[in-house]
Interface confidence: low
């Protein structure tokens, strides 16, 4: 902390300008009025202050606003944002998307820092949900943002926001996250026609249940193998050979290359070998002809 010393004669700052870069830390503390700094925050970014000098400016703002900075100051923090701690940011009430964008811009190109994460958390909580404009902004700065959220956090995403999601935004999502996102996507895209619907829903299908996959198999969608391999194993297992053939269309040929990998491997084990042979792909490992298959899960449900 900087000692309180009187400002030397003639050095009192009338405005925030380049002359201040020649001030020592104690002179900044003594000669820059905090209220002046707050009203001219936008100028700070244009002036090449040292990190030590920025510490002093931050200290002055902290003294002026012990309960947290107002949004008018936050929006113009610029590089001073990098000096903020998560504890500082938790005191803020950020409601403007423009403020969020301005601060994300400062951190652009760097990993998502704890400060940025706290800022986003405060902003989203303040809005009550992750609306489309916010999601657009966040995924523009951090393409994998959606997949960094827990399933609980994702549950607050309204279906309307799903329109902002691009396929690459889901690249790192795990099955539990897709389980939450898929029903929202289904709702969001429900009024689209068959082929358009499939293009939009495709990235979310890792969360789709069996009945939806069965429905898609009736729509000539020609799902590619990469999408099929990301489907939930428990959703794929009940599909018949005919349904998988319809679902994949010309891509069915690719099953051979994936026969040792899940979910194809597990699906093969559930099919009759006779049915698999109808595909003409040489898939092996199905249930031999003449064996009786008991569905114990149905029996358990009834007892």
């Amino acid at each position: 902390e900087v000692e309180k010393t009187a400002c030397p004669s003639g050095k009192k700052a009338r405005e925030i300008d380049e002359s201040l870069i020649f001030y020592k830390k104690w002179e900044l503390e003594a000669c820059v009025d905090a209220a002046l700094l707050a009203t001219q925050m936008d100028r700070v970014n244009a002036i090449p202050f040292t990190y030590e000098q920025l510490d002093v400016l931050k200290h002055k703002l902290d003294e002026l606003y012990p309960q947290g900075y107002p949004e008018s100051v936050i929006q113009h923090l610029g590089y001073l944002f990098l000096k903020m701690s998560p504890e500082d940011i938790r005191k803020w009430n950020v409601t403007s998307l423009e403020t969020l964008k301005a601060l994300l811009e400062v951190n652009k190109g760097h990993e998502m820092s704890p400060q940025v994460a706290t800022l986003i958390d405060r902003f989203v909580k303040g809005r009550g949900q992750l609306d489309k404009d916010t999601l657009d902004t966040l995924t523009a700065f951090y393409p994998g943002y959606l997949c960094s959220l827990s399933p609980e956090e994702l549950s607050s995403v309204p279906p309307s926001s799903i329109w902002a999601v691009r396929p690459q935004d889901l690249d790192t999502c795990d099955p539990r996250q897709l389980d939450v996102l898929y029903p929202k996507a289904r709702l969001a895209f429900q009024n689209m026609n068959g082929s358009e619907y499939f293009v939009k829903i495709q990235s979310f299908l890792g969360g789709a249940p069996t009945e939806d996959l069965k429905a898609l198999s009736q729509q000539n969608v020609s799902m590619d193998l990469a999408t099929f391999m990301k489907l939930r194993t428990d959703a794929v297992l009940p599909l018949t050979v005919a349904e998988v053939q319809k679902l994949l269309g010309p891509h069915v040929e690719g099953l051979k290359a994936e026969e040792r990998h899940r979910p194809v491997r597990d699906w093969i084990l559930r099919q009759r070998q006779d049915d698999l042979d109808t595909l003409g792909l040489g898939l092996q490992g199905g249930i031999p002809n003449g064996y009786l298959v008991l569905d114990l899960s149905m029996q358990e449900a009834l007892s």
Partner: nanobody, 118 residues
């Protein structure tokens, strides 16, 4: 520069246990998700466990659920994989991996061999 160094691999009998450790250095913060992948001969790399730094939420595929447990010690910059009830099919090179939060796994260790055999 980010570095990940695995240890704890070895030969173990079916049904046995092993604990893998991963020492992480060079991170500017703990703001990373960590994961363990494995690669058996002639197969692709598969994720066996991951943990978020933010909320410590973990993820396991069906093949290891209930047998493997991932944990982390942020203060020591360590990530662990406790593997119980090991099976022959768990034989593979195990890799520690890290990702910037919300981005793909982009940092990898050199790997440690785990062999399950009687």
């Amino acid at each position: 520069e980010v570095q990940l160094v695995e240890s704890g691999g070895g030969l173990v009998q079916p049904g046995g246990s092993l604990r893998l450790s991963c020492a992480a250095s060079g991170f500017t913060s703990n703001f990373y998700s960590m994961g363990w992948f494995r690669q058996a001969p002639g197969k692709g790399r598969e994720l066996v466990a991951s943990i978020n730094s933010f909320d410590s939420i973990t993820y396991y595929p069906d093949s290891v659920e209930g047998r493997f447990t991932i944990s982390r010690d942020n203060a020591k910059r360590m990530v662990y994989l406790q593997m119980n009830s090991l099976r022959a099919e768990d034989t593979a090179v195990y890799y520690c991996a890290a990702r910037k939060k919300g981005l793909a796994f982009s940092y990898w260790g050199q790997g440690t061999q785990v062999t399950v055999s009687s």
